[in-house]
Amino acid sequence: SGPLPKPSLQALPSSLVPLEKPVTLRCQGPPGVDLYRLEKLSSSRYQDQAVLFIPAMKRSLAGRYRCSYQNGSLWSLPSDQLELVATGVFAKPSLSAQPGPAVSSGGDVTLQCQTRYGFDQFALYKEGDPAPYKNPERWYRASFPIITVTAAHSGTYRCYSFSSRDPYLWSAPSDPLELVVT
């Protein structure tokens, strides 16, 4: 018999956690698991419980996590990795829309995330979307072109800036930008 199926690992309420705010990491396997192992990758840190409650996020807790479980002598495959990001480590960038935040359906718009610091990575989030758009950019300004805009692009956007040297330590979010598709 092969390895047991992998568990799921999630961060609640979100894997983007402002410094000093709480977050819970939860490893979910099948019923009746004997032992869970939740580990922080690239370190020697772990715990043998399914739930890790972090009462106040710290820089040192940011990073990649994964979990697995044991039944009898068999270990499961590891979960997909979870990237736990500390936000608010740096000042917020600014987010703007070119030519403007109101765009006609079928038109083009570019969202630009700009910081005065030397960050080389940017992430753009649309409220309600599970994952960010990421864009490496050398010159402290990241452009996210949206070609042929549709009504689905309407919504509230925020961006973050960070460094590839510390990819789990992010800025505070930009002020929200409301994109209106007419």
Partner: nanobody, 126 residues
Framework: QVQLQESGGGLVQAGGSLRLSCAAS????????IGWFRQAPGKEREGVSC????????YYADSVKGRFTIARDNAKNTVYLQMNSLKPEETAVYYC???????????????????WGQGTQVTVSS
């Protein structure tokens, strides 16, 4: 709110003793490893002694073995560091720190601890 409050520092003569206390609040104390660290003037912070959450296993820096004792009282949410036969070179600010994760290494590493107290000054005069 996570808080660690050290107390028990002060001025002591070489060869004397002090007992430091670290009172914790704002988290489930039983689940956390606790470490004592110190930073002497002009030097880097170093691990002195740590105690795990799971089995109460302890670590001591070589320089303090046989003289320092770490103990935890989960009922009082407090960890103690009994320091005997103190030396002038042990003058430093002593910090306690907490970690919700175990560390599989055999020593206290500053990077493995997430929550820190403000420190208490220990001065050992000759």
């Amino acid at each position: 709110q996570v808080q660690l409050q050290e107390s028990g520092g002060g001025l002591v003569q070489a060869g004397g003793s002090l007992r430091l206390s670290c009172a914790a609040s704002g988290f489930t104390f039983d689940d956390y490893a606790i470490g004592w660290f110190r930073q002497a003037p002009g030097k880097e912070r170093e691990g002195v002694s740590c105690i795990s959450s799971s089995d109460g296993s302890t670590y001591y820096a070589d320089s303090v073995k046989g003289r320092f004792t770490i103990a935890r009282d989960n009922a009082k949410n407090t960890v103690y560091l009994q320091m005997n036969s103190l030396k002038p070179e042990e003058t430093a600010v002593y910090y306690c720190a907490a970690s919700p994760l175990y560390y599989s290494g055999s020593y206290c590493r500053e990077t493995e601890y997430d929550y820190w107290g403000q420190g208490t000054q220990v001065t050992v005069s000759s």
